[in-house]
Interface confidence: low
């Protein structure tokens, strides 16, 4: 349905608060060194220029596309060359290519302050002074710092954001009430990021058919009871609102997601008893519980698989007729009947299918070719869940930390090229598997382990991507989506690897230690144990948890002392030395 | 919500045609293989014909070969069946579906008697 005003189509859907909040969120992903004043000035002059298009589709430049208008916009800031380099050359461009230029210089790790908390009493009064400020700072600080964010759950965190303060700064005990809603956020801020970061690179590194492979998937295991037609019609729409929220199209994903939600509340009788409680909420609440509602549970007596895709005598036929609806239907069947297994695998299976059928449907007889299919897959099954037995074990026997430091040296061993920031990131994220996982029952474990895994490992192949430093990263993060996980797990040490030089101040401490929380003098610690592992590629568990507890013993030794700053000093020279000598250095 | 509209369907003589139309809405028809299956009086489901979702694929059940013809236009989410010289034998409840599914419509009906 064409508008005469893109523009003002979705100020009138989104209302104002929402087109703002949106435009916002868009102007700090594409350019995230730009000062907080300087996006809400432009903000406010696209809402005035959205508005007299409300008033008059015809006026002058309110038939332009979004793109064009704000592309125009974003090229009006003045120290664009200076802050941004390269990027200012998108402006030379022309639409679509314009956008593309700013997308493709989107920044994962954008060098940014970290952001400190301020005391509850500061941010209780900021809050109170200038709620809306308030509130579109925390828009900005996030967008900026996570560009690939889905802006219309960006709206859900803000609002519980809001929700918190109106709550807590009221409170007694603000701080007790305030700090642990503060944490949940930003954990599961961080969390949405990561997810959506992987739906983003699967959509721009591997193609619209591989995500609408994973929504298949994905939706099948959560609406069993659902029809093909509808978890097709479902995995179309669904693919529609993630290419726009990746593409940069913020507005258009956040209304046509609200028609999503709209749609599968009208339709829930035909997708899932487990809609209802979502369906009842606000709009930004019930797109969000529809996105993390429980699997449905599963028709009963569904038949064999094997009659129609593998004894039927027409699977090759169907096939030819439409390959990636049989395979769609297939993928369909296989996941409503196992939401025991993650996504990923059901992917890999489907592939070994597709695979299977290319080849037999071409042989002299095809049927008695691809009659043990299903044989192939039963390997494919079992190696993720003895690998999630084992590192489930493992960390049971070792708790979250040492897990940790074991993923730690197993990664810095596979890939000690990458560097000791993203490495520590990585294995502290991968070794969080445990306390997610591993307490589920066996039902459970796989889906949430591997799928959580993707994630993960989809971080490192971003951060690696910016900075290309390893081959091996490059061949696991490239050659196959579902297979990455796989293609990390087997890599052995890396023979190749030039041990780097020591340097003795990689491994001098002060008493600034002492003052930071446990998490953060754990990334100490554990930054100082990859950093060890590149030293000596080849020391034992033994010797570096030798190393590692004689290190846990300076820091509490130091951090007791009256003269802590000394202590530092004159024990971490001891410490050094006798590292050098236990570990060969 | 996913919907296919059959029309088209009629009385007529024997040796004469019909064009059968499915309208389809509520899901991307392009990119589905879409299938007309049929249903005598009395008796089951039997397969007509069968359509890829690029067209390039066209296949027909050994009773209607030669005398029907499948066809789509993607664009305005239509599918058809072109059928010549009807037999009495092809009255039946005629369906459109998706893939090779079961029909979830109504259906046309087609009479050929004289």
């Known amino acids: 349905d064409a508008h005469k005003s893109e523009v003002a189509h979705r100020f009138k859907d989104l209302g104002e608060e929402n087109f703002k909040a949106l435009v916002l969120i868009a102007f700090a992903q594409y350019l995230q060194q730009c000062p907080f004043e300087d996006h809400v000035k432009l903000v406010n002059e696209v809402t005035e220029f959205a508005k007299t298009c409300v008033a008059d589709e015809s006026a002058e430049n309110c038939d332009k596309s979004l793109h064009t208008l704000f592309g125009d916009k974003l090229c009006t800031v003045a120290t664009l060359r200076e802050t941004y380099g390269e990027m200012a050359d998108c402006c030379a461009k022309q639409e679509p290519e314009r956008n593309e230029c700013f997308l493709q210089h989107k920044d994962d790790n954008p060098n940014l302050p970290r952001l400190v908390r301020p005391e509850v009493d500061v941010m209780c009064t900021a809050f109170h002074d200038n709620e809306e400020t308030f509130l579109k700072k925390y828009l900005y600080e996030i967008a900026r710092r996570h560009p690939y964010f889905y802006a219309p759950e960006l709206l859900f965190f803000a609002k519980r954001y809001k929700a918190a303060f109106t709550e807590c700064c009221q409170a007694a005990d603000k701080a007790a009430c305030l700090l642990p809603k503060l944490d949940e956020l930003r954990d599961e801020g961080k969390a949405s990021s990561a997810k959506q970061r992987l739906k983003c690179a699967s959509l721009q590194k591997f193609g619209e058919r591989a995500f609408k492979a994973w929504a298949v998937a994905r939706l099948s295991q959560r609406f069993p009871k659902a029809e093909f037609a509808e978890v097709s019609k479902l995995v179309t729409d669904l693919t529609k609102v993630h290419t726009e929220c990746c593409h940069g199209d913020l507005l258009e994903c956040a209304d046509d997601r609200a028609d999503l939600a709209k749609y599968i509340c009208e339709n829930q009788d035909s997708i899932s008893s487990k809609l209802k409680e979502c369906c009842e909420k606000p709009l930004l609440e019930k797109s969000h519980c529809i996105a993390e509602v429980e699997n449905d549970e599963m028709p009963a007596d569904l038949p064999s698989l094997a009659a129609d895709f593998v004894e039927s005598k027409d699977v090759c036929k169907n096939y030819a007729e439409a390959k990636d609806v049989f395979l769609g239907m297939f993928l369909y069947e296989y996941a409503r009947r196992h939401p025991d297994y993650s996504v990923v695998l059901l992917l890999r299976l489907a592939k070994t299918y597709e695979t299977t059928l290319e080849k037999c449907c071409a042989a002299a007889d095809p049927h008695e070719c691809y009659a043990k299919v299903f044989d192939e897959f039963k390997p494919l099954v079992e190696e993720p869940q003895n690998l999630i037995k084992q590192n489930c074990e493992l960390f049971e026997q070792l708790g979250e930390y040492k897990f940790q430091n074991a993923l730690l040296v197993r990664y810095t061993k596979k890939v000690p090229q990458v560097s000791t920031p993203t490495l520590v990131e990585v294995s502290r994220n991968l070794g969080k598997v445990g306390s997610k996982c591993c307490k589920h029952p066996e039902a459970k474990r796989m889906p949430c382990a591997e799928d959580y895994l993707s994630v993960v490992l989809n971080q490192l192949c971003v951060l690696h991507e910016k900075t290309p430093v390893s081959d091996r990263v490059t061949k696991c993060c490239t050659e196959s989506l579902v297979n990455r996980r796989p293609c990390f797990s087997a890599l052995e040490v890396d023979e190749t690897y030039v041990p780097k030089e020591f340097n003795a101040e990689t491994f001098t401490f002060h008493a600034d230690i002492c003052t930071l929380s446990e998490k953060e003098r754990q990334i100490k610690k554990q930054t100082a144990l990859v950093e060890l592992v590149k030293h000596k590629p080849k020391a034992t568990k033994e010797q570096l948890k030798a190393v590692m507890d004689d290190f846990a013993a300076f820091v509490e030794k130091c951090c007791k002392a009256d003269d802590k700053e000394t202590c530092f000093a004159e024990e971490g020279k001891k410490l050094v030395a006798a590292s050098q000598a236990a570990l060969g250095l | 919500q996913v919907q296919l509209q059959e029309s088209g369907g009629g009385l007529v003589q024997p040796g004469g045609s019909l064009r059968l139309t499915c309208t389809a809405s509520?899901?991307?028809?392009?990119?589905?293989?879409m299938s007309w299956v049929r249903q005598p009086p009395g008796k089951g489901l039997e397969w007509v014909s069968a359509?890829?979702?690029?067209?390039?694929?066209?296949n027909y059940a050994d009773s209607v070969k030669g005398r029907f013809t499948i066809s789509r236009d993607n664009d305005k989410k239509m599918l058809y069946l072109e059928m010549n010289k009807l037999k009495p034998e092809d009255t039946a409840v005629y369906h459109c579906?998706?893939?090779?599914?079961?029909?979830s419509s109504q259906g046309t009906q087609v009479t050929v008697s004289s």
């Open positions: 579906v998706i893939g090779r599914g079961s029909p």
């Open positions: 509520g899901f991307a028809f392009s990119s589905f293989g």
């Open positions: 359509i890829s979702a690029d067209s390039s694929t066209k």
